[in-house]
């Protein structure tokens, strides 16, 4: 468990309930030892994960962990779906679990649904 393999700590079956029009940061927690790997985000389209090009991304450092962040400025209804980050480490590709964004379009929602309502979707 303390090996120097790159680890991508996106939780299996994780999700985020968010609203169109709001800003949102999707974080990929990355553990590495010496050299920070190259990390990318992709969006799932069926079984294919389509690489997200030209998007605003950044790094954040916390104690033992770095976070590769995908910025949504703002969230669009079309951002609904599942995302995965992957790291290029020693010429091997390490893929995270996918995380799902449930986007509520506030134009079509008379009021913002509660977290419980969104979680039950």
């Amino acid at each position: 468990k303390e090996s120097c393999d790159v680890q991508l700590y996106i939780k299996r079956q994780s999700y985020h309930s968010i609203f169109a029009g709001d800003p949102f940061k999707l974080e990929c927690p990355v553990k590495y030892c010496a050299h920070r790997p190259q990390v990318t985000w992709c969006k799932l389209n069926g079984t294919t994960c389509v690489k997200l090009e030209g998007r605003h991304t950044s790094w954040k450092q916390e104690k033992n962990l770095s976070f590769f962040i995908l910025h949504f400025e703002p969230v669009l209804p079309s951002d609904n779906g599942s995302y995965r980050c992957s790291a290029n480490f020693l010429s091997a590709i390490i893929e995270s679990h996918s995380t799902t964004l449930y986007v509520t379009d506030v134009k079509s929602a008379s009021e913002r649904p509660s977290k419980d309502e969104m979680a039950s979707r």
Partner: antibody
């Protein structure tokens, strides 16, 4: 080293509620799922549910919906389960367990020592 | 819910002899991501459970290699090549492919 600290025992009257705690050290619970598992005397294990402390999202086994409420406080690195309307059927050991996901898919990696809950008048 | 059925209920084994525990699920545990989320836990007397094996056959760190997990779909097996005194306790299989997560009823390993 990861440790999960739970209180040893609780004695509660029927009809009352109780809130059990589980404090993690050696790991930031924001990067994990925190689970609660029930074990009645001389019986097997039952999964109650889990929380994603990063965003408060919860999932419960339907049979514990309404009975258990799982919360987390990331500032104290602590997860809680509140059990309501207690009866003798709730007398059991309650374990917390910490699951984290990396590229090698670790989960249910660490368990607390359990809190023995006795419901008795 | 997925029902996990373990056999036997109790296993009485002489130290140094092999042991085998079966776990059958009521539906396939192969997930859409291609992985099978089947784990084995050991609960020693008076202790909390400890995971031995995850993803059917991967040994947790510190688990002796006399333990092996195998199987696919709905049929899984935990084998101990040579039982030692520290192996006694209750073994549980547990699935995390389908919601809600469910455990087998447990197999008690006794030393003869």
């Amino acid at each position: 080293e990861v440790q999960l600290q739970q209180s040893v025992a609780e004695l509660v009257r029927p009809g009352a509620s109780v809130k059990l705690s589980c404090t993690a050290s050696g790991f930031n619970i924001k990067n994990t799922y925190m689970h609660w598992v029930k074990q009645r005397p001389e019986q097997g294990l039952e999964w109650i549910g889990r929380i994603d402390p990063a965003n408060g999202n919860t999932k419960y086994d339907p049979k514990f919906q309404g009975k258990a409420t799982i919360t987390a406080d990331t500032s104290s690195n602590t997860a809680y389960v509140q059990l309501s309307s207690l009866t003798s059927e709730d007398t059991a050991i309650y374990y917390c367990a910490l699951t984290y996901y990396g590229s090698s898919q670790h989960y249910f990696d660490y368990w607390g020592q359990g809190t023995t809950l006795t419901v008795s008048s | 819910d997925v029902v996990m059925t373990q056999t036997p209920l109790t296993l009485s084994v002489t130290i140094g002899q092999p042991a085998s525990i079966s776990c059958k699920s009521s539906q396939s545990l192969l997930d859409s991501d291609g992985k099978t989320y089947l784990n084995w836990l050991l609960q020693r007397p008076g202790q909390s459970p400890k995971r031995l094996i995850y993803l059917v056959s991967k040994l947790d760190s510190g688990v002796p290699d006399r333990f092996t997990g195998s199987g696919s779909g709905t049929d899984f097996t935990l084998k101990i090549s040579r039982v030692e005194a520290e192996d006694l306790g209750v073994y549980y299989c547990w699935q995390d492919t389908h919601f809600p997560q469910t455990f087998g009823g447990g197999t008690k390993l006794e030393i003869k």
